[in-house]
Amino acid sequence: VLEVYYTSLRCRCVQESSVFIPRRFIDRIQILPRGNGCPRKEIIVWKKNKSIVCVDPQAEWIQRMMEVLRKRSSSTLPVPVFKRKIP
């Protein structure tokens, strides 16, 4: 699940990784836009082994993967795309 969250919480990511994670090992991707207490965009990845990692938004692979996910129009994707808007 590719999620976009707008939150008033401060930054959640202490450390960021740029190490590639194949799509098939990803359960969910959460995108936290910058602002509201955090000066940077954050990307949090939930993996199928139940671990969580913050990914460097500048990492080429995550940009490529998000672009692929955005382009796919099907509603039954293993990593479907949806957004949560400001409450």
Epitope: R23, T76, P78
Partner: antibody
Framework: EVQLVESGGGLVQPGGSLRLSCAAS????????MAWVRQAPGKGLEWVAS????????YYRDSVKGRFTISRDNAKNSLYLQMNSLRAEDTAVYYC??????????????WGQGTLVTVSS | DIQMTQSPSSLSASVGDRVTITCKAS??????LTWYQQKPGKAPKRLIY???ILQTGIPSRFSGSGSGTEFTLTISSLQPEDFATYFC????????FGQGTKLEIK
């Protein structure tokens, strides 16, 4: 030439342990995710486990979670599968496979010849 | 978990025949599907990946097609060395293989 050579298979009693090894050559081992796949006699293929580049991330099929451990030693170009609490249904040929990156999705492109594990009393 | 249903489970054909093997996924896997050939006592050999990309060194009589949940492997003109077992593999969410199709000489 990419080469993967498995070893360590054999006959073991139910509840016993075995450690499989896979020696890799012909490519930069640390640049690839690696996997173990098994095939019971006369049956289909079954993914067992995968490991990322540095061994920090591992993934398992549900039926082996808590019993099997995949690991690697990049300095030795080697992949391992520690199998504990073995059951009769773990009897299979175990293959080591390289996972190649294609457009953000890994696909198994190179396989070893396999090593036979027989769990029987 | 994604299930892969492969059909037929066995198939008899003659040299020169056109053969089609099908794999159906229980959910959308886009184009993340690989086909393998396996001969007795040997490791699987990758034929096609990403649904329709032919592995280097594989003859052009092999082709793949499909998208979403339905995929096919076609051998346009069977050669003696093509008699083997064929497996599909989805790599969209972890890994799941099809049950295999044993291609035998009629």
């Amino acid at each position: 030439e990419v080469q993967l050579v498995e070893s360590g298979g054999g006959l073991v009693q139910p509840g016993g342990s075995l450690r499989l090894s896979c020696a890799a050559s012909g490519f930069t081992f640390s640049d690839y995710y690696m996997a173990w796949v098994r095939q019971a006699p006369g049956k289909g293929l079954e993914w067992v486990a995968s490991i990322n580049y540095d061994g920090g991330d591992t993934y398992y099929r549900d039926s082996v979670k808590g019993r099997f451990t995949i690991s690697r030693d990049n300095a030795k170009n080697s992949l391992y599968l520690q199998m504990n609490s073995l059951r009769a249904e773990d009897t299979a040929v175990y293959y080591c496979a390289r996972e190649e990156d294609y457009d953000g999705s890994y696909v198994m492109d190179a396989w070893g010849q396999g090593t036979l594990v027989t769990v029987s009393s | 978990d994604i299930q892969m249903t492969q059909s037929p489970s066995s198939l008899s054909a003659s040299v020169g025949d056109r053969v089609t093997i099908t794999c159906k996924a229980s959910q959308n896997i886009n184009k993340e599907l690989t086909w393998y050939q396996q001969k007795p006592g040997k490791a699987p050999k990758r034929l096609i990946y990403n649904t329709n990309i032919l592995q280097t060194g594989i003859p052009s009589r092999f082709s793949g097609s499909g998208s979403g949940t339905e995929f096919t492997l076609t051998i346009s003109s069977l050669q003696p060395e093509d008699f083997a077992t064929y497996f599909c593999l989805q790599q969209s969410s972890l890994y799941t293989f099809g049950q295999g199709t044993k291609l035998e000489i009629k």
